[in-house]
Interface confidence: low
């Protein structure tokens, strides 16, 4: 069966296309090419007589066509108007005609596209941005790239206008890009220069560093404040609610206990109109912010009731601390028989009674910290009586 094939099928404007003929019958008088899907004398391009090898132009001949003895038709310097169907009519020697129709499509060489934007400085979580790929051309595929990757699936990304427009709903700071659009048709492709978004955001809640709370007198206090923001945040400091300075860093040399208080960092973004603050408490003290665990010792841990006395001693290397005693979760002293001495380091019980048996511990503390000793068990026996509370030391 007579067939035609376009080589190539998709042709770039200005290039050439060859309409090849397959299964050409034998014993021919000649053949004729027509523009369109049917034989129409008014649209004949060229006729060819085999006997004379003579080509005769038809009404639709543009001067760019060449017919070959094998019936193939070459069209040079094609335009988009050449797109469409072409029909070959073969006139056999028995005067029976055969026809075959082929087609090709002419596409323009695409220019380098560009991206236009309705908002190049959007505000995070508030604004939407619409990118449009220019120019608008027919029979063109529009593709978008973000960070050199094809569009991710996201409800915030919407394509419209034949994929020519990319809309970002409710932009975030991570949407900076770069963005590129690519236009394609079957014969060419071109990509735009990258475009980046300047997403305005913040400030986020500021962070004050370092994280230390306690400082010793005479030290230098250097605090730095940072809040993620675009454009960068403007910072100011307040101490105990009183404005100090408009800087990102606060420096106070040779601090005293009077510098204790609440330090507020205020971050402001003049574009978004948003403000965020963080408050940090600073304590200037000679006291150790961490009190070591005290040691508890007893003159004896097993005593005879109504006869013996016992001394419990709480030892610590920390200074500027206070000591308190506990027995069965109760604060001591709890009776006339119990006495505290040597700055509460020693607890004396004289005489020891049955109800004094149990667990004792001491606690050392200052205004900012405290620590407890391990418990110690006091056993109280009575002569000629079974042992009570005969527990080993805790």
């Amino acid at each position: 069966q007579l067939t035609t094939e376009s080589m190539p099928f998709n042709v770039a404007e200005g290039k050439e296309v060859l309409l090849l003929v397959h299964n050409l019958p034998q014993q021919l008088f000649g053949y004729s090419w027509y523009k369109g899907e049917r034989v129409d004398g008014n649209r004949q391009i060229v006729g060819y007589a085999i006997g004379t090898q003579q080509a005769t132009p038809g009404p639709a001949n543009s001067g760019r066509e060449t017919i070959y003895p094998n019936a193939s038709l070459l069209i040079q310097n094609v335009t988009q108007n050449d797109t469409g169907f072409y029909t070959l009519q073969v006139i056999k020697s028995d005067l029976v005609n055969e026809e075959a129709t082929g087609q090709f499509h002419v596409y323009p060489e695409l220019p380098k596209p560009s991206i236009s934007s309705n908002n190049s400085n959007p505000v995070e979580d508030k604004d939407a941005v619409a990118f449009t790929c220019e120019p608008e051309t027919q029979d063109t595929t529009y593709l978008w790239w973000i960070n050199n990757q094809s569009l991710p699936v996201s409800p915030r990304l919407q394509l419209s206008n034949g994929n020519r427009t990319l809309t970002l709903l409710s932009v975030t700071r991570n949407d900076t890009g770069p963005y590129e659009c690519e236009i394609q048709n079957p014969v060419s492709a071109n990509r735009s220069d990258p475009v980046t978004l300047n997403v305005t955001y913040g400030p986020d809640t500021p962070t004050i560093s370092p994280s230390d709370t306690y400082y010793r007198p005479g030290a230098n206090l250097s605090l730095s404040c940072y809040a993620a923001s675009n454009p960068p945040a403007q910072y100011s400091w307040l101490i105990n609610g009183t404005f100090q300075q408009s800087t990102q860093e606060l420096f106070i040399p040779n601090i005293t206990v009077n510098n204790s208080g609440s330090y507020t960092c205020h971050a402001n973004n003049s574009v978004t109109g948003c403000n965020r603050t963080t408050v940090k408490t600073i304590i200037v003290t000679e006291l150790s912010p961490v009190v070591a665990k005290p040691q508890i010792k007893a003159s004896k841990t097993t005593v005879t009731g109504d006869k013996d006395s016992v001394n419990l001693t709480c030892s610590t290397n920390d200074t500027g601390i206070s000591i308190r005693w506990f027995f069965k979760n109760q604060s001591l002293p709890s009776s006339e028989r119990m006495k505290l001495s040597q700055g509460n380091t020693t607890l004396s019980i004289n005489p020891v009674k049955r109800e004094d048996a149990g667990t004792y511990w001491c606690e050392v503390f200052n205004p900012i910290s405290k620590n407890q000793s391990d418990p110690i068990m006091l056993n109280v026996n009575y002569n000629a009586l079974p042992q009570e509370n005969g527990l080993s030391p805790g």
């Epitope: 067939t3 099928f9 998709n10 397959h22 169907f85 075959a100 129709t101 079957p186």
Partner: antibody
């Protein structure tokens, strides 16, 4: 949803004829080239024939040339395969399939593939 | 015998990467692009890769195709049990003026 539904299969004696049909829906049928592919029981795929969107060109496997004819009726969204002089070795499930891109993407660099297939119709050639 | 040559079988364990080869000639793979199809048991074939390496919508990116000279290959990474199927390569043959398939590779997920 793009769908292809084959029909016309059945039992036929060697030397007999059968006409398969493939009804297309869910896409612009006249924009797409169509193919027939067959699969003998327990065997692999064998391409049978292809027809251009406008029926301007038709191609056949050597094994069926001169016996099978592919055609289409774009007004009815239907593809056909006329099978004559059937042989036992023509026994197979026959699938119709569409090209992945419309005819205007026909250059070989992208084109020759089949992206949507019918469920198949069984043709048994036996005496 | 098929114009395109594929190994009859391949296997792998879940999570593994498996590659299936397809060998042809200058008139098919050498001058035209390659297509890969997946056929699950009892179902019609499905387009997996076209134009050597392009994945249609809905095909996981675990599947990838490549071509070099007159050979092509299909790679499946992160193998899953549902990948157990027959896989076919295909290409237009300019000499035969026909579309040709490979003999198919049966992939078993162990």
């Amino acid at each position: 949803e793009v769908q292809l539904l084959e029909s016309g299969g059945g039992l036929v004696q060697p030397g007999g004829s059968l006409r398969l049909s493939c009804a297309a829906s869910g896409f612009t049928f006249s924009d797409y080239d169509m193919s027939w592919v067959r699969q003998a029981p327990g065997k692999g795929l064998e391409w049978v024939s292809m027809i251009y969107s406008g029926s301007s060109s038709k191609y056949y496997a050597d094994s069926v040339k001169g016996r099978f004819t592919i055609s289409r009726d774009n007004s009815k969204n239907t593809l056909y395969l006329q099978m004559n002089s059937l042989r036992a070795e023509d026994t197979a499930v026959y699938y119709c399939a569409k090209a992945p891109l419309p005819f205007y993407f026909r250059p070989k660099s992208y084109y020759y593939a089949m992206d949507v297939w019918g469920q198949g119709t069984l043709v048994t050639v036996s005496s | 015998q098929s114009v395109l040559t594929q190994p009859p079988s391949a296997s792998g364990t879940p999570g593994q990467r498996v590659t299936i080869s397809c060998s042809g000639s200058s008139s098919n793979i050498g001058s035209n692009n390659v297509t890969w199809y997946q056929q699950l048991p009892g179902t019609a074939p499905k387009l997996l890769i076209y134009a050597n390496s392009h994945r249609p919508s809905g095909v996981p990116d675990r599947f990838s195709g490549s071509k070099s000279g007159t050979s092509a290959s299909l790679a499946i990474s992160g193998l899953r049990s549902e990948d157990e199927a027959d896989y076919y390569c295909g290409s237009w043959d300019s000499s035969l003026n026909a579309y040709v398939f490979g003999g198919g590779t049966k992939l078993t997920v162990l």
